[in-house]
Amino acid sequence: LLVSQGVLLKCQKGSCSNATQYEDTGDLKVNNGTRRNISNKDLCASRSADQTVLCQSEWLKYQGKCYWFSNEMKSWSDSYVYCLERKSHLLIIHDQLEMAFIQKNLRQLNYVWIGLNFTSLKMTWTWVDGSPIDSKIFFIKGPAKENSCAAIKESKIFSETCSSVFKWICQY
């Protein structure tokens, strides 16, 4: 029975049978300030004209965008800041081809942060560019509350506590 086409966000580790998996902790803070959405200036690379995009050293190019895969581990907010400081942003997944490219280059079984978290203000899953998740495309499974952030593993997306430390992917 087909339920939904698209990327799946799966649960945090542990059963949802516990009434509270973690406490609400207020707005996610980065650099002592509330998380801001990425501006168009931050999204400096054009999606079109792949041939004109030059990626920096150690960045991979795919479909007009550049990708950087970390080797160290950080919390979601620290990963978010890291990417911004390098004129990029945490990964935004646009389609299944992009997911396949990412998975091909991960070569690991552990969780990796992407640019998606649950915002208490909008009460929705939101990409770091401010756009909401499209529930017709993405099935988001797992806690949808403050301090829920998204990580990928084996072409699936999981809801994890934002303070957890994982590797991450930057994109521009």
Epitope: L1, L2, V3, S4, Q5, G6, V7, L8, K10, C11, K13, G14, S15, C16, S17, N18, A19, T20, Q21, Q96, M99, A100, F118, M123, T124, W125, S135, F139, I140, K141, G142, P143, A144, K145, K153, E154, S155, K156, F158, S159
Partner: antibody
Framework: SVEESGGRLVTPGTPLTLTCTVS????????MIWVRQAPGEGLEYIGL?????SAYYASWAKGRFTISKTSTTVDLKITSPTTEDTATYFC??????????????WGQGTLVTV | DVVMTQTPASVSEPVGGTVTIKCQAS??????LAWYQQKPGQPPKLLIY???TLESGVSSRFKGSGSGTEFTLTISGVQCADAATYYC?????????????FGGGTEVVVK
């Protein structure tokens, strides 16, 4: 716990809403599922309401059912019942961990007769 | 869509015997399979999830095995209380979508 209510005898075409009342379950952490079982038949998945309120349906159920929720209830609306919708309707919690799904808490069910 | 084929539809076994129920998926679902027991007038009860993990409180006489497309539920030392209908339930999900499906059920009669 989960408890279904609202099942009754209805005439074809008359909308009917079933309600699942939950206790001790955080609906922002747990997806909830509706499953039905016609008399003497097997189990049939209808749809799921996600933690963020998004609803998803089995392909055959799209347009025939609507799932919604509040902080403590999950509703299943049968938009235009037919005799084929006669069944016991179960409200179920998905208790799946990591990348697995399974239904580990079921209500007793509520009978709908069309 | 994934189709689950469950066999046999019915099985009769004397007390103390062993019952084997098979579930076949039309495509690989990894280990995303659960088994349920349902007695008349009651809701289904989860027995096994992730193909082989026994749910808390369930007798160790129930054993699940398999992966990919072939799965088996084995009930050893069958008791009268095991008389029920058993269902498999699969989930297939990933970048192509999310699917749920139940098998047709197997009625277990204990003699």
């Amino acid at each position: 716990s989960v408890e279904e209510s609202g099942g009754r005898l209805v005439t074809p075409g008359t909308p009917l809403t079933l309600t699942c009342t939950v206790s001790g379950i955080d609906l922002s952490s747990c997806a909830m599922i509706w499953v039905r079982q016609a008399p003497g038949e097997g189990l049939e998945y209808i749809g799921l309401i996600n933690t963020d309120g998004s609803a998803y349906y089995a392909s055959w159920a799209k347009g025939r059912f609507t799932i919604s929720k509040t902080s403590t209830t999950v509703d299943l609306k049968i938009t235009s019942p037919t005799t084929e919708d006669t069944a016991t309707y179960f409200c179920v919690r998905d208790g799946g961990t990591d990348d697995h799904f399974y239904f580990n808490l079921w209500g007793q069910g509520t009978l709908v007769t069309v | 869509d994934v189709v689950m084929t469950q066999t046999p539809a019915s099985v009769s076994e004397p007390v103390g015997g062993t019952v084997t129920i098979k579930c076949q998926a039309s495509q690989s679902i990894g280990r995303n399979l659960a088994w349920y027991q349902q007695k008349p007038g009651q809701p289904p009860k989860l027995l096994i999830y992730s193909a082989s993990t026994l749910e808390s409180g369930v007798s160790s006489r129930f054993k699940g095995s398999g992966s990919g497309t072939e799965f088996t539920l084995t009930i050893s030392g069958v008791q009268c209380a095991d008389a029920a209908t058993y269902y498999c339930q699969c989930t297939d999900y990933g970048s192509s979508g999310l699917f749920f499906a139940f098998g047709g059920g197997t009625e277990v009669v204990v003699k």
